[in-house]
């Protein structure tokens, strides 16, 4: 107690009213309005509770204080007075703020800012939308994955600031009058190869594929060491040359000379060379048959594999070179007598004739191409008169059938000797390697020495042995006619042809002519 | 007639490059190597190397790898031979010879001098 | 690489006489080319493949050998025939020429 007579135990937030008692401060209430004991407290009035009387008028918020309160603008509203705070509805000034006017950088980029009442929405340009954790912020809509699949399927969708594009895919172009780019767009695959704009080298063809293309090796070149066939970097190298080596076993400088002939034509052979490098390789052929120098002095059956190896080797050559020709025909003729007759077309439906020296070949043109060989036909005949030499004593076999005929029927059999050959050895070749069973046959004429009288005259092939070798045979080749100096042969396969003279003493009708052939 | 006709004389200095050219006519420029032989005064004949205008492959000896670039361009029947980071010893007359390996360097350009001199 | 190896360096002839110039390969060799140079002039090629000549060439000029020899023969010089002659093998990479052989007139 002091002397004045008031109470020193009144709560914090009251004031003494005697001695006594107490009363809370404005804006502070306690359980009962007279604090007689220093255990009650007094506590802040919420003048802004919902029950208060307290009204603060609209666009505007009530803020409680401690022992008090205060009006205030709400956000987006100010005070046309300047008053921060107020105590009642009669005086609030408040009004909206135009925060766009306020600050035009407010929905930053690619938004429009829209005024409301205490506040402000950002509405987004087309092509884009609110970014949920910043609804101030306007992003892309990426239409490309929004799966809207806003593009033509031959299209790929190209999604840009505010907008996307539909392009042609790599390798594809507008379709006639279709734009490149608007959402309307439609495309069509580029034929890179029939147009030009592909990259092939030169020793590969090119194929078009959808969107793209490759390059595959020539018919008869591999891919270079180390690099995929198929692609759009395939760079080849002619096999043909690589496989023509001597045969093994064999031990002849002459030949070995020929070989090497051919290896360096090979070694930096490009397509664009083939004209020269086969007249070369037949320049060749022809010295190495004009002087065969030592193979001369190897036994008759390695003579007869030498020309195996080189009949079978040449054809394939041959074969690979030409498909690197342009259209057209070729003759090339040399010292010795090797001839080479050669017709390269882009298909056509007709029948073929070469025209040499001492032969001439027929035969329909459909045959030369294999079936999706993109490369030009070629339809080619070499006489190798000088490969008699080598074909010397070369056995005939002949067909059991035939074989048995001729013994029945022949009673002046001649045993002794090998068949005669009248003719030039001639090969025939195709830009198709598959002629084991052509669909329509070829005719041969030959032209050849005189057929002794009462002798047999056969139409041959070389039919290339299991051992590298060889012997001549009929299968498949009839006889149609022969003259004295002419033949005329038919054959259901190709290879190398001649005309043989047996040795069988033929009666003045044949009766087994026709069975023979 | 086939006919090559090689670019005029060259005065280079140290260290610079050349461009020489070789353009053909009379003959199917891919049917044969370009080659290209140097000549330096008072010596013989040097192979460089040959580019085959098809494909603008190359082939080149060990000593002009780096030194010689050569290309061919099949629109205007040209071939090219650049000499990089010349030096006095480069001074020569350079040839172009369209070639065959069968039948060898048949048809030459007329050469063209290469001097080099700071 | 092939080394060709010309001999002689130098022949010293008269007009009329025969002419044999050799050329020697460090390995065998398929196709060996001859030319003909004279002071100032691009070479000319005189043999190809050994021994077939070329186009205009007169044939006075022949050429044989194989393997590693070859030689040059011009059967009566010319007074137009006194220049260099370079054989040049085309058989392997690098290709290579002779180092030349000068026939001059005695």
């Known amino acids: 107690q002091d002397s004045r007579g008031c109470a020193r135990w009144c709560p914090q937030d009251s004031s003494c009213v005697n001695a006594t008692a107490c009363r809370c401060n404005p804006g502070f209430s306690s359980f009962s309005e007279i604090i007689t004991t220093p255990m009650e407290t007094c506590d802040d009035i919420n003048e802004c509770a919902t029950l208060s009387k307290v009204s603060c008028g609209k666009f505007s918020d009530c803020w409680n204080t401690e022992g008090s309160y205060d009006c205030v603008c709400s956000p987006g509203y100010e005070p046309v007075s300047g008053a921060k705070t107020f105590k009642n509805e009669s005086e609030n000034t408040c009004q909206d703020v135009d925060e766009c006017q306020q600050n035009p950088r407010l929905c930053k980029s690619y938004g429009t800012c829209v005024n409301t009442l205490g506040s402000y929405t950002c509405q987004c340009l087309p092509g884009f939308k609110l970014k949920p954790e910043d609804p101030k912020l306007c992003t892309d809509v990426n239409e490309c994955t929004s799966g809207q699949n806003p593009c033509h399927s031959s299209t790929h969708c190209l999604n840009n600031v505010g907008s996307y594009q539909c392009r042609c895919r790599p390798g594809w172009q507008p379709i006639p009058g279709s734009p490149n780019g608007p959402n309307n767009t439609v495309c069509e695959d580029v034929d890179e190869c029939s147009s030009g704009q592909h990259q092939c080298d030169s020793s590969t063809v090119c194929f078009n594929t959808v969107g793209s293309y490759s390059c595959r090796c020539r018919p008869g070149w591999k891919p270079r060491h180390g690099i995929p066939n198929n692609q759009k970097d395939t760079v080849c190298e002619d096999m043909t040359f690589s496989t023509w080596t001597p045969p093994p076993g064999v031990h002849s400088q002459t030949l070995s000379r020929f070989f090497d002939k051919v290896q360096d034509l090979g070694r930096d052979y490009k397509p664009g060379l083939a004209n020269n490098t086969i007249q070369s390789i037949l320049q060749a052929l022809d010295e190495l048959l004009e002087a065969p120098g030592d193979l001369e002095t190897l036994p008759r059956l390695q003579q007869h594999c030498v020309a195996s190896h080189l009949l079978d080797g040449l054809e394939d050559v041959l074969r690979g070179l030409s498909k690197n020709l342009s259209n057209g025909l070729l003759n090339f003729s040399y010292p010795a007598g090797t001839e080479l007759s050669l017709e390269v077309q882009k298909q056509v439906d007709r029948s073929v004739t070469l025209r040499q020296n001492q032969a001439v070949m027929q035969l329909d043109w459909n045959q030369a191409q294999k079936s999706g060989d993109p490369g030009p036909s070629v339809v080619g005949l070499v006489s190798i008169p000088g490969m008699g030499k080598l074909l010397a004593e070369a056995p005939l076999v002949l067909e059991p059938e035939k074989q048995m005929l001729l013994h029945e029927t022949h009673q002046g059999l001649l045993q002794d000797g090998s068949p005669i050959l009248l003719s030039d050895v001639i090969s025939a070749f195709l830009s198709n390697n598959d002629t084991q069973n052509l669909s329509s046959p070829v005719t041969f004429t030959f032209s050849h020495r005189s057929v002794i009288p009462r002798q047999k005259v056969l139409c041959v092939f070389w039919e290339h042995g299991q051992n590298g070798c060889g012997h001549w045979a009929t299968t498949g080749c009839s006889t149609i006619g022969t003259r004295d100096t002419s033949t005329i042969c038919r054959c259901t396969h190709l290879s190398s042809f001649a005309v043989l003279m047996a040795h069988y003493d033929v009666q003045e009708e044949d009766p087994v002519l026709t069975v023979i052939t | 007639q086939v006919q090559l006709q090689q670019s005029g004389a060259e005065v280079a200095k140290p260290g610079a490059s050349v461009k020489l050219s070789c353009k053909a006519s009379?003959?199917?420029?891919?049917?044969?190597?370009m080659q290209w032989i140097k000549q330096a005064p008072g010596q013989g004949l040097e192979w460089i190397g040959a580019?085959?205008?098809?494909?603008?492959?190359?082939r080149h000896t060990q000593k002009f790898k780096g030194k010689a670039t050569l290309t061919a361009d099949k629109s205007t029947s040209t071939a090219y031979m650049e000499v990089s980071s010349l030096r006095s010893e480069d001074t020569a007359v350079y040839y172009c010879?369209?070639?065959?390996?069968?039948?060898?360097?048949?048809?030459w350009g007329q050469g063209t001098t290469v001097t080099v001199s700071s | 690489e092939i080394v060709l190896t010309q001999s002689p360096a130098t022949l010293s002839l008269s007009p009329g006489e025969r002419a044999t110039l050799s050329c020697s390969a460090s390995?065998?060799?398929?196709?060996m080319h001859w030319y003909q140079q004279k002071p100032g002039l691009a070479p000319r090629l005189l043999i190809y493949?050994?021994?077939k000549l070329a186009s205009g060439i007169p044939d006075r000029f022949s050429g044989s050998g194989s393997g590693t020899d070859f030689t040059l023969t011009i059967s009566r010089l010319e007074p137009e025939d006194f220049a260099v002659y370079y054989c040049?093998?085309?058989?392997?990479?690098?290709?290579?020429f002779g180092q030349g052989t000068k026939v001059e007139i005695k």
């Open positions: 010879a369209r070639g065959f390996t069968a039948y060898g360097m048949d048809y």
């Open positions: 009379g003959y199917t420029f891919t049917n044969y190597w």
């Open positions: 580019v085959y205008p098809g494909d603008g492959d190359t």
């Open positions: 390995s065998s060799v398929s196709y």
């Open positions: 493949d050994t021994s």
């Open positions: 040049q093998q085309w058989s392997s990479n690098p290709l290579t």
